[in-house]
């Protein structure tokens, strides 16, 4: 049996063809990059750049591709088998526990602390106490107590747990 050619295998100029590829379900499921027809007889390919499915499924529709928010950069585009990958812009981060938006990284550590970790798209700068080496997880000091590496940005709440 010949292999099913899915949308992600095609060159960009070939992807615009409106006809969606079809194949038969296997044990009632359709492969990644497809969804099942309403009558359950066919697997219909997702539309490149519009929707996707990542696993074997019995979805009646492929899932909508994510659009990156402002303040995010697109690391990789949506294909028929993988959603868009978005990442916070430089100087901002998104925590796993509060993932709704990218937050500005702090520009420096509170007085008496030293920076041991840089701002990354998934974490704020990391500060430790000079003497004890323990992470900062307490209240944010007043702005004038904050040692900054660039002027003008007040400290945001420190969210690193110790």
């Amino acid at each position: 049996e010949s292999a099913l050619i899915t949308q992600q295998d095609l060159a960009p100029q070939q992807r615009a063809a409106p006809q969606q590829k079809r194949s038969s379900p296997s044990e009632g499921l359709c492969p990644p990059g497809h969804h099942i027809s309403e009558d359950g007889r066919d697997c219909i390919s997702c539309k490149y750049g519009q929707d996707y499915s990542t696993h074997w499924n019995d979805l009646l529709f492929c899932l909508r591709c994510t659009r990156c928010d402002s303040g995010e950069v697109e690391l990789s585009p949506c294909t028929t088998t993988r959603n868009t990958v978005c990442q916070c812009e430089e100087g901002t981060f998104r925590e796993e526990d509060s993932p709704e938006m990218c937050r500005k990284c702090r520009t420096g550590c509170p007085r008496g602390m030293v920076k041991v970790g840089d701002c990354t798209p998934w974490s704020d700068i990391e500060c430790v106490h000079k003497e004890s080496g323990t992470k900062h997880s307490g209240e944010v000091p007043a702005v004038e107590e904050t040692v900054t590496s660039s002027p003008g940005t007040p400290a945001s709440p420190c969210s690193l747990s110790g």
């Epitope: 499924n57 009646l60 899932l63 994510t66 959603n83 796993e96």
Partner: nanobody
Framework: EVQLLESGGGEVQPGGSLRLSCAAS????????VGWFRQAPGKEREFVSA????????YYAESVKGRFTISRDNAKNTLYLQMSSLRAEDTAVYYC???????????????????WGQGTLVTVKP
Amino acid sequence: EVQLLESGGGEVQPGGSLRLSCAASVSTFGTSPVGWFRQAPGKEREFVSAIRWDGVGAYYAESVKGRFTISRDNAKNTLYLQMSSLRAEDTAVYYCALPRRGDSELPSTVKEYGYWGQGTLVTVKP
């Protein structure tokens, strides 16, 4: 507080069946996708299956395709996993999980889930 309580695990022979349940004590259960993961001894936690908030459509890992069926009863805040044709390699602790954020229609990676049950052990051996 989100609480997820799995049950239904046990020891079964190869080729046998089990039905796992997961009772959720959270009001948003009926509006959220929910998933099953498993962790075998010495291995990483892996995706098994996930189901849409409305129960219409689900994802399955290739390793369980055609053998496992996920379902849910939103009126009872309960998730199910019907497992049949069980194999030795299905031996693991099975966890149900709710995603940490609501913007993914059907999350399927460990990091997308923030709320986990304590797990129920499934052992498949002759």
